[in-house]
């Protein structure tokens, strides 16, 4: 680290005095200080002498000696006061520019440390500082306004008490610039617009910024529109608004509209599309298949997308049958608006019951008429099975009825012993019935099939089981012949509930 002689932090001299500041380092050294007259610099290898034989108040300041070759960048400093009774202030700059919220240093250096107790900062012409001006003072550096605000852009003077009277410095102009975070903020309203030919329309393009210096324009397709601009200032922002009013729209007004604003930071633009139509329209669609299949007991949401102009005058979900005359509860229907002209309507069908299979229709109406979109909901059921013993054309026959959806497949098993369900070890014979007779097959209902197994003689220590399965599940019914006649039961002696 370089060493300065005299080895004191501060040196106080009178005007006209001779001042010699010597700096010695390991290598070459350099002086840095306030720009002021009458200094002579003499360098000799590792030492440098700064001297004047006629010090003035303008020599007041901090002089720093550095050693450029030092990797640690060490330096030494001495502060020189040239105390001129007529000049209490040495002003190093008459204009200071900072950004908002930065500290602003007003560099009026006190020429006599004794005066420190009586210093103050004022605005020119003796006006007091604005409220909430937070500042501090350093005799070496001057006044610092902390976290300067745009409104504090003023002309200031430094004041010192000398012999009971205030002596002012020359003025310092502070310019506090707004921090412009980026291009102006933009809004273009509406985000989308549809009108029938002959109707009125309005498009509003507005831009705002903390700084007044920005431009805004509205263009249609690629043509810049000449629209008078309204300006305003509120919430600490400058606002410029362009309003396009069209009394009677026509097809040539349709297309892309862009709102563009620019400042020194760059350009922002946002666009919207204006559609002009011949007449009202209403379109219904769904991303779902209109034919739905779910398992009984499951839940289902039916969703319809609506595109309409003008807006809907009415809409509802209706159950069209074929079962009970129940209607969907309004609380199960939900509407959400994607944007001005598109909506989604959802009907929730929780834990579906058999009587809720059928057709569900969404109806909507606007000045263009009414439209409907209908879903067909089929429920899937696991098979339910029952077996009876009967005689057909004189032959003993086991008759198995299985109902479910999709249509169940039927398999017969004959196994040894009396059991609720044949397991593999007991099975004597297996018959698949690839084409059971369909007894009933109506839309939205279970399919009921019937399979016949002709048995010449029933073996009494055996069980005959009819099994049915489909994609939902399986069901079975065991038939156990007993000496007093036939005995049938579902597995585990369960009663059959059709």
């Amino acid at each position: 680290i370089p060493v300065i002689e005299p080895s004191v932090p501060e040196l106080v001299v009178k005007p006209g005095a001779t001042v010699t500041l010597r700096c010695v380092g390991n290598g070459s050294v350099e002086w840095d200080g306030p720009p002021s007259p009458h200094w002579t610099l003499y360098s000799d290898g590792s030492s440098s002498i700064l001297s004047t034989n006629n010090a003035t108040f303008q020599n007041t300041g901090t002089y720093r000696c550095t050693e450029p070759g030092d990797p640690l960048g060490g330096s030494a400093a001495i502060h020189l006061y040239v105390k001129d009774p007529a000049r209490p202030w040495n002003v190093l700059a008459q204009e200071v520019v900072v950004f908002e919220d930065q500290d602003a240093l007003l560099p009026c250096l006190l020429t006599d440390p004794v005066l420190e107790a009586g210093v103050s900062l004022v605005r020119v012409r003796g006006r007091p500082l604005m409220r909430h001006t937070n500042y501090s003072f350093s005799p070496w550096h001057g006044f610092t306004i902390h976290r300067a605000k745009f409104i504090q852009s003023q002309d200031y003077q430094c004041s010192a008490l000398m012999g009971g009277r205030k002596v002012m410095s020359i003025s310092i102009r502070l310019k506090v610039q707004k921090v412009i975070p980026g291009p102006p903020a933009l809004t273009l309203v509406p985000a989308e617009l549809v009108r029938i030919r002959g109707e009125a329309a309005q498009i509003v393009c507005s831009a705002s910024s903390v700084d007044v210096n920005f431009d805004v324009f509205l263009q249609h397709n690629n043509t810049k529109l000449a629209i008078p601009q309204q300006s305003d200032f509120h919430n600490n922002r400058y606002q410029k608004v362009l309003t396009l009013n069209l009394d009677q729209v026509d097809f040539q007004h349709a297309g892309n509209y862009s709102c563009v604003a620019s400042n020194v930071q760059g350009k922002h633009s946002t666009s919207m599309f204006f559609r002009v139509v011949e007449s009202a329209y209403l379109n219904l669609s769904s991303e779902q298949n209109l034919i739905q299949e779910v398992t009984v007991g499951e839940g289902l949401n039916l969703k319809v997308m609506v595109e309409a102009y003008p807006g809907l005058q009415g809409f509802n979900w209706t159950y069209l049958g074929p079962f009970s005359d129940h209607q969907p509860e309004p609380k199960l229907a939900n509407a959400t608006t994607k944007d001005t002209y598109r909506h989604t309507f959802t009907l929730s069908l929780p834990r579906l019951k058999p009587s809720e299979a059928g057709r569900y229709s969404f109806l909507a109406r606007n000045p263009g008429g009414w439209r409907a979109l209908t879903f067909e909901l089929t429920l899937r059921y696991p098979p339910e099975v029952s077996v009876i013993w009967t005689f057909i054309n004189g032959s003993g026959t086991l008759l198995c009825a299985a109902s479910g959806y999709p249509q169940p497949n039927v398999t017969w098993l004959q196994c040894s012993g009396h059991t609720d369900r044949c397991d593999e070890a007991q099975v004597l014979q297996v018959w698949d019935d690839p084409y059971p007779e369909v007894l009933s097959q109506e839309p939205f209902h279970k399919v009921t099939v019937q399979s016949l197994l002709t048995v010449e003689t029933l073996e009494h220590n055996q069980t005959y089981e009819c099994r049915a399965h489909n994609s939902v599940g399986s069901g079975s019914w065991a038939f156990i012949p007993i000496s007093a006649g036939a005995h049938t039961h579902p597995p585990d002696e369960f009663l059959f509930t059709p």
Epitope: G297, G299, N334, R351, S355
Partner: antibody, heavy 116, light 106 residues
């Protein structure tokens, strides 16, 4: 107001069947659906199945092959029958009124222990 | 089946504190979520249905909210009698329940 009361065997041997009766009082059984829900010791709730007012049933797919629910409206009784019980079927079995979107009236439950 | 995941598994709170219980569904269940309180040695009792509707007789310190997959039960100021297990359940499809949150009072 509606009250539900379960009655069961308490102890069931492994591989045997379970029969529980739920008796409904304070309202007619043909006016609401009944679900069965069970709770193994120290565990959560598990829905087994429902019997609708018309007598149709809907089962949890995990129990479809060994569960049957039936009812006798005239006696205001609902029956649960489950076959092939194992130790992990040990639970409290609840009979519950089921207005479809929630379960609002619960019986006190009957404890079933599967053990030899 | 739809899986309902509850968190936390347990919590210990002081009387007067506010508590929030979370329940997440593995798929969209609209607002078909109900909350049940089960005190020791008792059967569950319905608190909230349709995600946010308070059942008859339930104190207004119990509030439910949420839709689609995320649901919350809030007890605004815990009372000593709120010591219980709390279960959420969905009834959009085959009913399923969460594993429960045990609420203990400090």
């Amino acid at each position: 107001q509606v009250q539900l009361k379960e009655s069961g065997p308490g102890l069931v041997a492994p591989s045997k069947s379970l029969s529980i009766t739920c008796t409904v009082s304070g309202s007619s059984l043909d006016s609401f659906d009944i679900s069965w829900i069970r709770q193994p010791p120290g565990k959560g709730l598990e829905w087994l199945g429902v019997i609708w007012t018309g007598g149709g049933t809907n089962y949890n797919s995990g129990f479809m092959s060994r569960l049957r629910i039936s009812k006798d409206n005239s006696k205001s009784q609902v029956f649960l029958k489950m076959s092939s019980l194992q130790s992990d079927d040990t639970a409290i079995y609840y009979c519950v009124r089921d207005p479809r979107l929630y379960f609002d009236v619960w019986g006190a439950g009957t404890t079933v222990t599967v053990s030899s | 089946n739809i899986v309902m995941t509850q968190s936390p598994k347990s919590m210990s709170m002081s009387v007067g504190e506010r508590v929030t219980l979370s329940c997440k569904a593995s798929e969209d269940v609209v607002t078909y979520v109900s909350w049940y309180q089960q005190k020791p040695e008792q059967s569950p009792k319905l608190l909230i249905y349709g995600a946010s509707n308070r059942y008859t007789g339930v104190p207004d310190r119990f509030t439910g909210s949420g839709s689609a997959t995320d649901f919350t039960l809030t007890i605004s100021s815990i009372q000593a009698e709120d010591l219980a297990d709390y279960y959420c359940g969905q009834t959009f499809s085959y009913p399923t329940f969460g594993t429960g949150t045990k609420l203990e009072i400090k």
